[in-house]
């Protein structure tokens, strides 16, 4: 992917297509790459992150990792290929339009990843799969 | 194939109101953050508002020349994107294009013309 | 919002110039800036994002530069068909927001 700074558009003759034929086009997401957190404990939490990019090829989709050890939590936000492993694991969910975290086994941490293919969908990253979107007690995330 | 197709356009007085629509088709039209722009004869392009996803909650924004007069919805399931235009001016005629929010794909655009 | 103020508003060049145009913004924008091509009656076509990069289709005589607040367009060999108006774009911010314009025309 390309620096979070650095915005791409892409041109009617670079067409890549999904399963049904339906042209992909490079989505926006948030493009913080990692920052401490203060998402804990909670069904959603909003990424915070104030960088929305373009990824640079039609087929990336956005994806979030949140870690916690120690010493802190992080949470990143990137663009990434759904073919190429993250952290060495597959996005078995980047077709889903929401961020639904799912817990990956990583020794000396506590480690969650979601990806999803609609426009900025790794802003709200949830821990829940029944998180309804207006629940009241939605916290947001304040990066220190 | 992507295509953006607007239409809607038309006359209308002063103070009156008109609904835009745009037909969507050839990509994933519930992913996406759609937008209007539009131009005024022989004048530059004008950013009007946006539209997010249905599923991030459908949040809008707009221009300030526009803002309180114009609303943007969009139907995922009929793939169409509108823009209801109300108390217009005369100063709002433009020809008002559907675009792929912050990428490379237009439509051909609508003219709209506010006069009495 | 973020102001976008071209130069010069129009120009005349002749087949084989070099053409230069400026955009400047009124704070800065990193590198989100966006140059069009529009032709009458058309939709703006994109040449340009990220102030430098050259979208695909797009001829090489076709270059961009800047960050911050001070952009350029060039057109090192101008053609017959690059007689248009230019647009830059920033896109750092909402709303996204349009320079005035610049007119390419024939000498």
């Known amino acids: 992917t390309i620096p979070p700074h650095v915005q791409k558009s892409v041109n009617n003759d670079m067409i890549v297509t999904d399963n049904n034929g339906a042209v992909k086009f490079p989505q926006l997401c948030k493009f913080c790459d990692v920052r401490f957190s203060t998402c804990d404990n909670q069904k959603s939490c909003m990424s915070n992150c104030s960088i929305t990019s373009i990824c640079e090829k039609p087929q990336e989709v956005c994806v979030a990792v949140w870690r916690k050890n120690d010493e802190n939590i992080t949470l990143e936000t990137v663009c990434h290929d759904p073919k190429l492993p993250y952290h060495d694991f597959i996005l078995e969910d980047a077709a889903s339009p929401k961020c639904i975290m799912k817990e990956k086994k990583k020794p000396g941490e506590t480690f969650f990843m979601c990806s999803c293919s609609s426009d900025e969908c790794n802003d709200n990253i949830i821990f829940s799969e029944e998180y309804n979107t207006s629940n009241p007690d939605l916290l947001l995330v304040i990066f220190q | 194939q992507v295509q953006l197709v607007e239409s809607g356009g038309g006359l209308v007085e002063p103070g009156g109101s008109l609904r835009l629509s745009c037909a969507a088709s050839?990509?994933?039209?519930?992913?996406?953050?759609m937008s209007w722009v539009r131009q005024a004869p022989g004048k530059g392009l004008e950013w009007v508002g946006r539209?997010?996803?249905?599923?991030?909650?459908?949040?809008?924004q707009f221009a300030a020349p526009v803002k309180g007069r114009f609303t943007i919805s969009r139907d995922d399931s009929k793939n169409t994107l509108y823009l209801q235009m109300n108390s217009l001016k005369t100063e709002d005629t433009a020809v008002y294009y559907c675009?792929?929010?912050?990428?490379?794909?237009w439509g051909q655009g609508t003219l709209v013309t506010v006069s009495s | 919002d973020i102001q976008m103020t071209q130069s010069p508003s129009s120009l005349s060049a002749s087949v084989g110039d070099r053409v230069t145009i400026t955009c400047r913004a009124s704070?800065?924008?990193?590198?989100?800036l966006n140059w069009y091509q529009q032709k009458p009656g058309k939709a703006p076509k994109l040449l340009i994002y990220?102030?430098?990069s050259l979208q695909s289709g797009v001829p090489s005589r076709f270059s961009g530069s800047g960050s911050g607040t001070d952009f350029t367009l060039t057109i090192s060999s101008l053609q017959p068909e690059d007689f248009a108006t230019y647009y830059c774009?920033?896109?750092?911010?909402?709303?996204?927001?349009f320079g005035q314009g610049t007119k390419v025309e024939i000498k």
């Open positions: 675009t792929l929010d912050l990428r490379d794909y």
């Open positions: 050839g990509f994933k039209f519930s992913n996406a953050w």
């Open positions: 539209i997010k996803t249905t599923i991030s909650g459908g949040a809008t």
């Open positions: 704070q800065s924008i990193s590198s989100y």
């Open positions: 990220a102030a430098s």
């Open positions: 774009q920033q896109s750092y911010s909402t709303p996204p927001t």
